[in-house]
Interface confidence: medium
C-alpha cells in the first residue's frame, strides 16, 4: 500500500477501561497529532478506519463491527464498546485516509477487572483538597458523552468499599461530592458509579479517584529556614570535615516550585574551585508540607574556607529567604609542653 504518515504507538495515552462497562475512545489523531478536527476531515472526503492488534499478537486485524447488539461500533471519531470484554485488550489503530492522504496512530487499550471494593490495577487520578478550607467538591470524571442530557442517571458515591449515605462532612450531590470541611480522615479513594439506561439495557460507569488533603493556602507561609541558625556555630580546625545542613520548611502550595541552594562567598558552589559536595533529602508531612535538607560538605576544610561566607537560600511561590551559617576556625588549645615550659620561665 502507499506511504502513510505513521505516528507510531502513542504510549502517552495508555487507556484503561473497566471490564463489562461502556467505553468511548476518541481517535487521538484529531486531539494530538493533526491540526484539523474530524468534521473538517470528513467534509474533505477523508475516511476514518479502525483496526487492532490483540494482546501478545503481531497481526493487525479489522475490528468486527457486526457483533450482537452492536457491542463495538464507531460514531464519528469515537470507537464505542457497549460494553467491553477482557479480551478487547490490545493496541488499537485509527487511520485517516483517502486516495492521496494517509495518517495513522496506534494506542494501547487495557481492559481491567475490579473487585467488589473497586480495587484494580487502574491508575487513579489524584484530586487535592485544601485542609479545613470551606466547601470543596470533587466531580465524577470522564462521564461526558456517554448519555444524552435528557437521560437522568443514578449516581452512587463510595469511599473505599462503603456507600456514602451521608457522612457528617461529605454530601453527595449527583455527579459532585461536596466536602463541607476536608480533613486528613477524608484521604482515600472515592468511587462514583453512574447507572444509565440505553436501548432497554442498563449500563454502569465506574470512576475512582484518590483524594489527598493538603495544606491550605490560608495557612501558607514563606519558606522557613530552621538551619543554619544563630544558635549553632560551625567551629572547625583546618583539615577537618565541614558539614552544614540547610533545613527548610515549605508550606504546601499548589504548583509551587520549592528551591533550596547554597552560595559560598555569593557564588553557587559549581562556580568556585573548592571541593564541595551537596546532598539533598526531602520529606513530606501528611498535608504535603515539605522539608528539604541540603547538606554542604567540604571533606578537608582549609583556613581559607573557614573565612568564607556560607549562605543557605530558599524560594517558593510565597517568597525568598536566606540565612548565613556561623563558621569559624577553632583556636587550637595551647600544647601542654609549651605551657609548662613557659611556667618555668623558659624562653
Amino acid at each position: 500500500s502507499e506511504r502513510c504518515d505513521d505516528w507510531g504507538l502513542d504510549t502517552m495515552r495508555q487507556i484503561q477501561v473497566f471490564e463489562d462497562e461502556p467505553a468511548r475512545i476518541k481517535c487521538p489523531l484529531f486531539e494530538h497529532f493533526l491540526k484539523f478536527n474530524y468534521s473538517t476531515a470528513h467534509s474533505a472526503g477523508l475516511t476514518l478506519i479502525w483496526y487492532w492488534t490483540r494482546q501478545d499478537r503481531d497481526l493487525e486485524e479489522p475490528i468486527n463491527f457486526r457483533l450482537p447488539e452492536n457491542r463495538i461500533s464507531k460514531e464519528k471519531d469515537v470507537l464505542w464498546f457497549r460494553p467491553t470484554l477482557l479480551n478487547d485488550t490490545g493496541n488499537y489503530t485509527c487511520m485517516l485516509r483517502n486516495t492521496t492522504y494517509c495518517s495513522k496512530v496506534a494506542f494501547p487499550l487495557e481492559v481491567v477487572q475490579k473487585d467488589s471494593c473497586f480495587n484494580s490495577p487502574m491508575k487513579l487520578p489524584v484530586h487535592k483538597l485544601y485542609i479545613e478550607y470551606g466547601i470543596q467538591r470533587i466531580t465524577c470524571p470522564n462521564v461526558d458523552g456517554y448519555f444524552p442530557s435528557s437521560v437522568k442517571p443514578t449516581i452512587t458515591w463510595y469511599m473505599g468499599c462503603y456507600k456514602i449515605q451521608n457522612f457528617n462532612n461529605v454530601i453527595p450531590e449527583g455527579m459532585n461530592l461536596s466536602f463541607l470541611i476536608a480533613l486528613i480522615s477524608n484521604n482515600g479513594n472515592y468511587t462514583c458509579v453512574v447507572t444509565y439506561p440505553e436501548n432497554g439495557r442498563t449500563f454502569h460507569l465506574t470512576r475512582t479517584l484518590t483524594v489527598k488533603v493538603v495544606g491550605s493556602p490560608k495557612n501558607a507561609v514563606p519558606p522557613v529556614i530552621h538551619s543554619p541558625n544563630d544558635h549553632v556555630v560551625y567551629e572547625k580546625e583546618p583539615g577537618e570535615e565541614l558539614l552544614i545542613p540547610c533545613t527548610v520548611y515549605f508550606s504546601f502550595l499548589m504548583d509551587s516550585r520549592n528551591e533550596v541552594w547554597w552560595t559560598i562567598d555569593g557564588k553557587k558552589p559549581d562556580d568556585i574551585t573548592i571541593d564541595v559536595t551537596i546532598n539533598e533529602s526531602i520529606s513530606h508531612s501528611r498535608t504535603e508540607d515539605e522539608t528539604r535538607t541540603q547538606i554542604l560538605s567540604i571533606k578537608k576544610v582549609t583556613s581559607e574556607d573557614l573565612k568564607r561566607s556560607y549562605v543557605c537560600h530558599a524560594r517558593s511561590a510565597k517568597g525568598e529567604v536566606a540565612k548565613a551559617a556561623k563558621v569559624k576556625q577553632k583556636v587550637p588549645a595551647p600544647r601542654y609542653t609549651v605551657e609548662l615550659a613557659c611556667g618555668f620561665g623558659a624562653t
Epitope: G134, N168, S178, I181
Partner: antibody
C-alpha cells in the same frame, strides 16, 4: 447522649431590643472533641423551624450561616469544654423564638447534621 | 438560596390510614433531604435522612421517597401517637468564593389523627 442548652438566665432569656445574649450547648455522654458539627435552629412561637448556622467543633471551627443572619449572630466553640455557643446581637422582637442546638450523627457513615437535639431555650426580646 | 415548600397543611387521617406529605425544593438537592417529627413542647426528632433512609429507632411505618426537587413522606398504618407537625429539611451546597451551605426547612405539615 444528649445536648444540654444553657443561656438566657433565670428569666428564661428576656432581652431588651438592641441587646445581646449568648446561648451555649454542652455535650454530655460524649465528647465534642471527637469533632462534630453543631447546628442552631430557631422556632418563633407557633411558627416553623428556621436554620441559623452550623459550626465544626474541631481544630478549624469552620462555620456556615444562613444568609439572613447578616453578621448579627456568631457561632463559636470550646473544644475542651465540649461546647458550642451562639452569640445573639442587635436583637429585635422578630428574634423572639425557641433556639435549639442540634448535633450531627455519631458515626461518619450515618451522620446527619441534625440527628440529636437540645431541649431548646426560649429567648424573648421585649422592652 | 434554597426554598422548601411543604404541602398540604393540615392533613387529617384515621387510625390505620395512610398519610402522604409532599416537599418541593427550589433547587436540585439530589437525595439530600431529611424529615423530622415535632410534638408540642418538644424538639424535633429525626425520622428519615438521605430522602429514604430510616433513622435509628424509627418505626418502619414511616418511609421517604423522591430525589431532585420532589420528595414524599408516607406514614402507613397511622397511629394516634403520630399526631404531630412534620418538617422536611433540604441540604444544598453552593460553591462560591467562600463556599456556602444552605439548610432550609419546609413550612411544616400538621397531621391530625382522628
Amino acid at each position: 447522649q444528649q445536648l444540654e442548652q444553657s443561656g438566657g438566665g433565670a428569666e428564661g432569656g428576656l432581652v431588651k431590643p438592641g441587646g445581646s445574649l449568648e446561648l451555649c450547648c454542652k455535650a454530655s455522654g460524649f465528647s465534642l472533641s471527637n469533632s462534630y458539627w453543631i447546628c442552631w435552629v430557631r422556632q418563633a412561637p407557633g411558627k416553623g423551624l428556621e436554620w441559623i448556622g452550623c459550626i465544626y467543633v474541631g481544630s478549624s471551627g469552620s462555620t456556615y450561616y444562613a444568609s439572613w443572619v447578616n453578621g448579627r449572630f456568631t457561632l463559636s466553640r470550646d473544644i475542651d469544654q465540649s461546647t458550642g455557643c451562639l452569640q445573639l446581637n442587635s436583637l429585635t422582637a422578630a428574634d423572639t423564638a425557641i433556639y435549639y442546638c442540634a448535633r450531627d450523627g455519631a458515626t461518619s457513615t450515618s451522620g446527619h447534621l441534625f440527628e440529636l437535639w437540645g431541649q431548646g431555650t426560649l429567648v424573648t426580646v421585649s422592652s | 438560596a434554597l426554598v422548601m415548600t411543604q404541602t398540604p397543611s393540615p392533613v387529617s387521617a384515621a387510625v390505620g390510614g395512610t398519610v402522604t406529605i409532599n416537599c418541593q425544593a427550589s433547587e436540585d438537592i439530589y437525595s439530600n433531604l431529611a424529615w423530622f417529627q415535632q410534638k408540642p413542647g418538644q424538639p424535633p426528632k429525626l425520622l428519615i435522612y438521605r430522602a429514604s433512609t430510616l433513622a435509628s429507632g424509627v418505626p418502619s411505618r414511616f418511609s421517604g421517597s423522591g430525589s431532585g426537587t420532589e420528595f414524599t413522606l408516607t406514614i402507613s398504618g397511622v397511629q394516634s401517637d403520630d399526631a404531630a407537625t412534620y418538617y422536611c429539611l433540604g441540604i444544598y451546597t453552593y460553591i462560591s468564593a467562600d463556599g456556602s451551605l444552605y439548610n432550609a426547612f419546609g413550612g411544616g405539615t400538621e397531621v391530625v389523627v382522628k
